[in-house]
Interface confidence: low
């Protein structure tokens, strides 16, 4: 449906309020490094020019599109090439060649200062003194640390965001109520993050038909009522939703993701019984709730499986006729059929199904040759359930913090050039699988663990990409999105490493790691077992528990001390020469 | 069960004229864009013409434009492709799909040949 503006259409439909924040995410998550007052003038500009075409489409400049209208705008910023760089270059390009260049220099690991959170009373004053500017501030500040971040959910984190400060700046003990709320955003933000980056990896470095396969899975899992007609409709207009705002169309991903839960709501009779709370909720609070919705009852009275996909005389006739459409119906089918699994494992069903047609459809006798295909899924399915069954009875022994360290030296033995921050990082995350799903029973393990390592592992993968350093992992993220966590976890220890030079610099603490949250004391702690297993790759679990053990012991020594300074200074020597000891460094 | 039925094609001539008709069975025909597909001897599926669950939206190739027009009727559950003026170089099997997915129906054969 053509409109004479769409920058008119898109104000009309979204309305000036969510109009504004979207065109602030977008431009954040372009330009990075800009000051938070050039974002807010430019968006301001962009806001009166569309104000303009609201009241007059055909007025000048109106038919333009929105890349072609947001470019523009961006490349007016008179800093362009001294705080981009190569960056500025993109602004010499015409539509679509330009958007595209804007994407490919974003950035997912920003040289951006951490965000630290101000005193309660501090935050409080600036909310009530300038509320609209506080809520700029935190789409502006979450927006250009999290280039892929989900745009319209943002906008949901956003109004959760007030919501917290409208109600603890007024509540008796301020703090009390509101540290915990912003944790809370926090934590979820980072893995509404991840989720995000994982999707848009998904479509732009394995293309529209990985997405759409990983859509089919999931949402026959959560809709095993749907009809595959159904199941289809929802996957094509969740994939327009999410390559729109994987591709910087914010203001088109938002007002399709709307369109989509007012679908979805219209037609729950056809899709799940488990929608009705979250239709009746405002639009983001809406379309978050249907994103979250537990999977929908199975169907009492599904057949066998093997009846249309294996013991059928159609089998190769249907999937020579629409190959992408019988393989979407064998997914639907064992998707719908199978909550219990992971959506990668499903794929990975699918992948060796597809294969398997491939092979045996141009063979002399095709049904005996794919009599037998459901048998090749047993060691699949057995692959992730024993690796599930493994990690969490050793999370349940040691807890998270040390199962945290004990995949700390798995992955830097695995993969030791990668740099010490981003394992740290990484190791951290994939140690958080443990609290988040040892604690479900056998049938929500897997789908809970390894759909999580996945975005985990993307994240691996995406910090990578930007300094690429271990041909092994680029080898594990590259070859097949489904198989990256078997590909990692099937890496031994890299011998092919030269052990790094012991540097005593690297080991050397300060009185200032007392001061420090139990969190940031152990991401310290963590950084040095790193170091350490890449000065000695070879050390043995025992050497490196005790050599840790020694430096929990020294860190709390010395913060007990009265000089604490001097503690660090003389007893550090003493702990490095123990652990080249003790580590034969 | 989805089921896309479609019907009328045949042999015409340069010129001519055809009307295929599309029947569904088996999902909320009313809720989903449909569109024509066809597939040329030796060639891949292209694109012809799509139709938005409520008609208000209809969209053609530029191969086709001014020639075809597209058309439904959700009680029947029924898409029609009326087809006139006619060139060789539209012989094909035509499909009905949904949305714009890929074939997976049989399909009609239209052959357009003096």
């Known amino acids: 449906d053509a409109h004479k503006s769409e920058v008119a259409h898109r104000f009309k439909d979204l309305g000036e309020e969510n109009f504004k924040a979207l065109v602030l995410i977008a431009f954040a998550q372009y330009l990075q490094q800009c000051p938070f007052e050039d974002h807010v003038k430019l968006v301001n500009e962009v806001t009166e020019f569309a104000k303009t075409c609201v009241a007059d489409e055909s007025a000048e400049n109106c038919d333009k599109s929105l890349h072609t209208l947001f470019g523009d705008k961006l490349c007016t910023v008179a800093t362009l090439r001294e705080t981009y760089g190569e960056m500025a270059d993109c602004c010499a390009k015409q539509e679509p060649e330009r958007n595209e260049c804007f994407l490919q220099h974003k950035d997912d690991n920003p040289n951006l200062p951490r965000l630290v959170r101000p005193e309660v009373d501090v935050m409080c004053t600036a909310f009530h003194d300038n509320e609209e500017t506080f809520l700029k501030k935190y789409l502006y500040e979450i927006a250009r640390r999290h280039p892929y971040f989900y745009a319209p959910e943002l906008l949901f984190f956003a109004k959760r965001y007030k919501a917290a400060f409208t109600e603890c700046c007024q509540a008796a003990d301020k703090a009390a109520c509101l540290l915990p709320k912003l944790d809370e955003l926090r934590d979820e933000g980072k893995a509404s993050s991840a989720k995000q980056r994982l999707k848009c990896a998904s479509l732009q470095k394995f293309g529209e038909r990985a997405f759409k396969a990983w859509a089919v899975a999931r949402l026959s899992q959560r809709f095993p009522k749907a009809e595959f007609a159904e199941v289809s409709k929802l996957v094509t207009d969740l994939t327009k939703v999410h390559t729109e705002c994987c591709h910087g169309d914010l203001l088109e991903c938002a007002d399709d993701r709307a369109d989509l839960a007012k679908y979805i709501c219209e037609n729950q009779d056809s899709i799940s019984s488990k929608l009705k709370e979250c239709c009746e909720k405002p639009l983001l609070e809406k379309s978050h709730c249907i994103a979250e919705v537990e999977n929908d009852e199975m169907p009492a009275d599904l057949p066998s499986l093997a009846a249309d996909f294996v013991e059928s005389k159609d089998v190769c006739k249907n999937y020579a006729e629409a190959k992408d459409v019988f393989l979407g119906m064998f997914l639907y089918e064992y998707a719908r059929r199978h909550p219990d699994y992971s959506v990668v494992l499903l794929l990975r069903l699918a992948k060796t199904y597809e294969t398997t047609l491939e092979k045996c459809c141009a063979a002399a006798d095709p049904h005996e040759c794919y009599a037998k295909v459901f048998d090749e899924f047993k060691p699949l399915v057995e692959e992730p359930q024993n690796l599930i069954k493994q990690n969490c009875e050793l999370f349940e022994q040691l807890g998270e913090y040390k199962f945290q360290n004990a995949l700390l030296v798995r992955y830097t033995k695995k993969v030791p050039q990668v740099s010490t921050p981003t394992l740290v990082e990484v190791s951290r995350n994939l140690g958080k699988v443990g609290s988040k799903c040892c604690k479900h029973p056998e049938a929500k393990r897997m789908p809970c663990a390894e759909d999580y390592l996945s975005v985990v592992l993307n994240q691996l993968c995406v910090l990578h990409e930007k300094t690429p350093v271990s041909d092994r992992v680029t080898k594990c993220c590259t070859e097949s999105l489904v198989n990256r966590r078997p590909c990692f976890s099937a890496l031994e220890v890299d011998e092919t490493y030269v052990p790094k030079e012991f540097n005593a610099e690297t080991f050397t603490f300060h009185a200032d790691i007392c001061t420090l949250s139990e969190k940031e004391r152990q991401i310290k702690k963590q950084t040095a077992l790193v170091e350490l297993v890449k000065h000695k790759p070879k050390a043995t679990k025992e050497q490196l528990k005790a050599v840790m053990d020694d430096f929990a012991a020294f860190v709390e020594k010395c913060c007990k001390a009265d000089d604490k300074e001097t503690c660090f200074a003389e007893e550090g020597k003493k702990l490095v020469a123990a652990s080249q000891a003790a580590l034969g460094l | 069960q989805v089921q896309l039925q479609e019907s009328g094609g045949g042999l015409v001539q340069p010129g001519g004229s055809l009307r295929l008709t599309c029947t569904a069975s088996?999902?909320?025909?009313?809720?989903?864009?449909m569109s024509w597909v066809r597939q040329p001897p030796g060639k891949g599926l292209e694109w012809v013409s799509a139709?938005?669950?409520?008609?208000?939206?209809?969209n053609y190739a530029d191969s086709v434009k001014g020639r075809f027009t597209i058309s439904r009727d959700n009680t029947k559950k029924m898409l029609y492709l009326e087809m006139n003026s006619l060139k060789p170089e539209d012989t094909a099997v035509y499909h009905c799909v949904i949305g714009r997915g890929s074939a997976s129906s049989q399909g009609t054969q239209v052959t357009v040949s003096s």
């Open positions: 139709i938005s669950a409520d008609s208000s939206t209809k």
């Open positions: 088996g999902f909320a025909f009313s809720n989903f864009g």
